[in-house]
Interface confidence: medium
């Protein structure tokens, strides 16, 4: 799901799943502004007051982060310049499942996209030889 148009930028997300107890990734991409100080990335979760994660002015700003995500989130800071706003989520919990919004603001405009994040005890299928 994505938004584009005048004063909006295109943001793209991908539905993904996370294994409980492991690390997961919520994928989000956008056309990057080459000016890193002009980029703001916000991750929000439906039903949660406060932010999942915020990256702005070239660094993380966790002042408004919800306590359930404290110490468990990170963006790929070196890849923001090439349009990667994906969020790394450590130690995935069952309660992490839900609808997330990846919100991007740059000097050109803003945009957002939603993704459904599923959690569970997933495992690789057995391969019988």
């Amino acid at each position: 799901f994505g938004i584009s148009g005048k004063h909006f930028i295109t943001v793209t997300t991908f539905t993904s799943a996370g294994n409980i107890g492991e690390d997961g990734t919520l994928s989000c991409t956008f056309e990057p502004d080459i000016k890193l100080n002009g980029i703001v990335i916000q991750w929000l979760k439906e039903g949660i007051k406060g932010l999942v994660h915020e990256f702005k002015e070239g660094k993380d700003d966790l002042s408004q982060q919800h306590e359930m995500f404290r110490g468990r989130t990170a963006v790929f800071a070196d890849q923001v310049v090439v349009g990667n706003a994906s969020l790394r989520l450590k130690n995935v919990q069952l309660t992490d499942a839900g609808t997330y919004t990846c919100y991007i603001r740059t000097s050109k405009g803003k945009g957002n996209a939603n993704l459904e994040y599923k959690t569970g005890a997933f495992s690789m299928p057995e391969i019988n030889v």
């Epitope: 056309e31 990057p32 080459i34 100080n37 310049v81 090439v82």
Partner: antibody
Framework: EVQLLESGGGLVQPGGSLRLSCAAS????????MHWVRQAPGKGLEWVAS????????YYADSVKGRFTISRDNSKNTLYLQMNSLRAEDTAVYYC?????????WGQGTTVTVSS | DIQMTQSPSSLSASVGDRVTITCRAS??????LNWYQQKPGKAPKLLIY???HLQSGVPSRFSGSGSGTDFTLTISSLQPEDFATYYC?????????FGQGTKLEIK
């Protein structure tokens, strides 16, 4: 092999025009922003212009704003720099560079000489 | 515009020496500071990105540190191929700006 190859440099009179090209290979060109950087003889490096992956963001140094135009054709894996109203102070080696974490891939450069 | 000031402008050293080059930004650039090496007649080569991250393929004798406004490039043990000019560059905002360069020469 990841590679950038500039072309189009040469001798031009003040007030003249040139178009530089930068052919990219060995990587997904359409995923990366690109820069032009120049170096006058015996001097340091000077950033000239930048363009984002889909051309949505374009920036210029004040010294070239209104005279130079950066563009790209992702279908041809090529970056361009159209240079108009050239001045003696534009004489330099012009490099294209890939925008990643730093300017991580550079071309070999093409020389532009502005002289009457 | 953000001004980048390198020191020293030139430096004489011997093979095996430990060398430090500093770069100061006129305002904060967080950790968006890159270091390049350039040899005569060649294109610059990225050594360090984001202040302290070693670019792939660059020898581990090169290291970078700092954040905000003050940054350092260190070569732990100079090798003959390290004699070149070194530039810092901020990639925090446009106009991107380079330091004036530090020429590292053989003593």
């Amino acid at each position: 092999e990841v590679q950038l190859l500039e072309s189009g440099g040469g001798l031009v009179q003040p007030g003249g025009s040139l178009r530089l090209s930068c052919a990219a290979s060995g990587f997904t060109f359409s995923s990366y922003g690109m820069h032009w950087v120049r170096q006058a003889p015996g001097k340091g490096l000077e950033w000239v212009a930048s363009i984002s992956s889909s051309s949505g963001y374009i920036y210029y140094a004040d010294s070239v704003k209104g005279r130079f135009t950066i563009s790209r054709d992702n279908s041809k894996n090529t970056l361009y720099l159209q240079m108009n109203s050239l001045r003696a102070e534009d004489t330099a080696v012009y490099y294209c560079a890939r925008a990643s974490s730093g300017m991580d891939v550079w071309g070999q450069g093409t020389t532009v000489t502005v002289s009457s | 515009d953000i001004q980048m000031t390198q020191s020293p402008s030139s430096l004489s050293a011997s093979v095996g020496d430990r060398v430090t080059i500093t770069c100061r930004a006129s305002q904060t650039i967080r950790s968006y500071l890159n270091w390049y090496q350039q040899k005569p007649g060649k294109a610059p080569k990225l050594l360090i990105y984001a202040a302290s991250h070693l670019q792939s393929g660059v020898p581990s004798r090169f290291s970078g540190s700092g954040s905000g406004t003050d940054f350092t490039l260190t070569i732990s043990s100079l090798q003959p191929e390290d004699f070149a000019t070194y530039y810092c560059q901020q990639s925090y905002t446009t106009p991107y700006t380079f330091g004036q360069g530090t020429k590292l020469e053989i003593k």
